[in-house]
Interface confidence: medium
């Protein structure tokens, strides 16, 4: 989750990640070009609520200050760990040209060529080592290894990095061997659910644009609000059908049949007081989808959820009621009422897929995660467009840890707050070709909402 160039003994000891941009060693953060400056990391100091009651026990508190307290602060539309890139939605050498908004479309409406580009890009991301970032394999206190001289890091592929980010946001706090503190989640069960997953997808989309050399590459979405008992993207033409001889595995006719998963052995990491190190841990699995005749959410569920005008409500947790966020996440019923026995929308779609996709720490291993969350984000975006909320709609304090408005989303780096992603998709350089009105449009006639 940190730039490779910063994970040196000096960088870790000095807690400073302000790399130079280009060959000029003094051009830290693109400073000589006016792109940014090395600055003190700002973190949210307001109180949080919820079940995490410890203090200074977790690497992710005050993120990312346990690791780096000085990072590049980019000016204008510049972005990136060395201010060498542009903010989402901007392009050009000076990042002052608005990029034409890319269009995220229903996966079923892609042409054969577009479908191949998407699936090929995912496969390429699974096989390509990330050029700039590494993952940490030990906790903050053990980050320099047993001798205190060797940063404990590992290379991993672009897609596995995407998986690791999700794992790290939900992993337990480790208090010692086999002593996990589980009451913590930086990307679910609170308002940050929508912004965290939005940034997560934007990150992957940008990586896939870079890998494919196509700046207008867009992630498709899976409209899971069909009310059916089948996964219509689980086919060999799309994200892989079930294997005949072992339906928990993916058909050999799909490129995803060979995908191995990372970050699945949570109990093992807890026992060894370590972090997921990107080692492959077996094949991707989807147990029988829609077990017990479970059905996917319906379009009516989506519409009910969109009719909730309050973004979130106290205690900003999984028991919030009449909260758009909690209904979308799926802890509330779609109409905003609470029924702890019921899963809905996003949660129901994950549960329906069973297998790897049903466990938060490993869910992102399954490429269905990408298109599932793309649709979840489309619902969030529709709500934003309908309600045009001010930032005050987001709690400044007393949300669970990681979920206050100004908290830096864990473990994204350089730091980015929830507030920075509480914008319409268009402001971030993309749009959805989706119609979430009463009549469900056939996939061949999608319209821009």
């Amino acid at each position: 989750q940190f730039p490779r160039v910063c994970m040196t003994l000096d960088g870790v000891l000095n807690k400073e990640c302000c790399p130079p941009l280009g060959p000029e060693a003094t051009n830290i953060c693109g400073f000589l070009e006016g792109r940014g400056q090395c600055a003190e990391v700002q973190t949210d100091t307001r109180p949080w609520s919820g079940p995490y009651i410890l203090r200074n026990q977790d690497d992710r508190e005050q993120w990312p200050r346990k690791f780096f307290n000085r990072t590049c602060k980019c000016t204008g539309n510049f972005a990136g760990y060395n201010c060498g890139g542009c903010k989402f939605g901007w392009t050009g050498p000076d990042c002052n040209r608005k990029k034409p908004a890319i269009l995220r479309r229903n996966i079923h409406s892609l042409t054969a060529q577009e479908r191949e580009q998407f699936l090929g890009a995912l496969d390429l991301a699974k096989k390509s080592i990330h050029p700039d970032y590494v993952i940490t394999t030990q906790h903050w206190l053990g980050l320099l290894g047993p001798n205190g001289t060797q940063p404990q890091i590992a290379n991993c592929s672009v897609y596995d990095f995407f998986v690791w980010l999700h794992y790290y946001s939900v992993r337990d706090t480790l208090l010692g061997p086999g002593r996990p503190y589980k009451a913590i989640d930086f990307s679910h069960q609170g308002p940050a659910f929508v912004t965290w997953h939005r940034y997560h997808l934007l990150w992957l989309e940008r990586e896939l644009q870079r890998l494919t050399g196509n700046e207008s590459f867009a992630l498709p979405y899976w409209n899971f609000a069909t009310g059916k008992n089948e996964c219509d993207v689980c086919t060999d033409e799309l994200l892989g059908a079930a294997r005949q001889d072992d339906p928990t595995l993916i058909s050999r006719n799909s490129r995803f049949s060979t995908w191995e998963i990372v970050c699945d052995s949570l109990d093992d990491y807890n026992r060894r007081v370590t972090l997921c190190n990107g080692t492959y841990e077996g094949l991707l699995r989807r147990n029988k989808v829609g077990r017990n005749n479970e059905k996917l959410p319906t379009l009516k569920n989506v519409q009910d959820c969109l009719s909730l005008q309050k973004f979130d409500s106290p205690p900003f947790f999984q028991n919030s009621t009449f909260s758009f966020r909690n209904a979308l996440e799926g802890f509330d019923k779609a109409d905003g009422t609470l029924d702890s026995q019921v899963m809905n929308l996003h949660n129901l779609a994950h549960s329906f897929l069973n297998g790897t996709n049903a466990l938060p720490h490993s869910a992102a291993n399954d490429p269905v995660f990408v298109v599932l969350h793309s649709f979840t984000d489309a619902i969030f975006d529709e709500w934003l467009k309908r309600n045009n909320p001010s930032t005050d709609a987001w709690p400044q304090e007393l949300a669970p840890i990681g979920h206050n408005r100004m908290y830096n989303m864990v473990p994204f780096f350089p730091p980015v707050t929830n507030e920075e992603l509480f914008l319409t998709a268009e402001q971030l350089g993309y749009n959805y070709a989706v119609d979430l009105s009463e009549e469900e449009a056939p996939v061949w006639s999608t319209t821009l909402s």
Partner: antibody, heavy 122, light 107 residues
Framework: EVQLVESGGDLVKPGGSLKLSCAAS????????MSWVRQTPDKRLEWVAT????????YYPDSVKGRFTISRDNAKNTLYLQMSSLKSEDTAMYYC???????????????WGQGTSVTVSS | DIQMTQSPASLSASVGETVTITCRAS??????LAWYQQKQGKSPQLLVY???TLAEGVPSRFSGSGSGTQFSLKINSLQPEDFGSYYC?????????FGGGTKLEIK
């Protein structure tokens, strides 16, 4: 109390060299970037050089690049400015100043010394 | 290089008055601007950085505002110790440059 005391200013001939020093006290010198700023006889202020807290990074305007070298000795809490190939337009009061935020480099200077005078004339 | 243009070059005011000094950057410097005060025979002192953040120990009658290319320093209820010269300086990308200064004199 933060104190910066410059020394080494003198009258020097064009083409000559001079080394200025700045002794720092009252703060953790190694945590701060430092700069030299000069004030010309017509009272204009001109930034001359900056060095990062650890000494790894140095910055100069084009007007002095290649002629002036900023350096520091964190063990001695001292900042230096080595000036060579001096020109008449380098005549000024030279101030050493502390960068106001404890980052690698930040351009607002929160403490200044009393200055040392450099005159370049034949 | 970014040019900083200060106005007025000089200004006379009385104790208790409110004065405003402006500074214009030749290009967008966002909020990377500092203001300094210099009294006769003394070295400059930082008043404001990041366009509006008061430096430690600076009285609240001083306030900075602006972003992009237009900035101002306002001094409410002038005190005798406020007379002297004022300089703006951008701290965006190097080279950092200063304005030509504004001399504030007692009327």
């Amino acid at each position: 109390e933060v104190q910066l005391v410059e020394s080494g200013g003198d009258l020097v001939k064009p083409g000559g060299s001079l080394k200025l020093s700045c002794a720092a006290s009252g703060f953790t010198f190694s945590s701060y970037g430092m700069s030299w700023v000069r004030q010309t006889p017509d009272k204009r202020l001109e930034w001359v050089a900056t060095i990062s807290s650890g000494g790894s990074y140095t910055y100069y305007p084009d007007s002095v690049k290649g002629r002036f070298t900023i350096s520091r000795d964190n063990a001695k809490n001292t900042l230096y400015l080595q000036m060579s190939s001096l020109k008449s337009e380098d005549t000024a009061m030279y101030y050493c100043a502390r960068l106001g935020v404890t980052t690698v480099v930040h351009g607002a200077m929160d403490y200044w010394g009393q200055g040392t005078s450099v005159t370049v004339s034949s | 290089d970014i040019q900083m243009t200060q106005s007025p070059a000089s200004l006379s005011a009385s104790v208790g008055e409110t004065v405003t000094i402006t500074c214009r950057a030749s290009e967008n410097i966002y909020s990377y601007l500092a203001w300094y005060q210099q009294k006769q025979g003394k070295s400059p002192q930082l008043l404001v950085y990041n366009a509006k953040t008061l430096a430690e120990g600076v009285p609240s009658r001083f306030s900075g505002s602006g972003s992009g290319t237009q900035f101002s320093l306002k001094i409410n209820s002038l005190q005798p110790e406020d007379f002297g010269s004022y300089y703006c300086q951008h701290h965006y990308g190097t080279p950092w440059t200063f304005g030509g200064g504004t001399k504030l004199e007692i009327k």
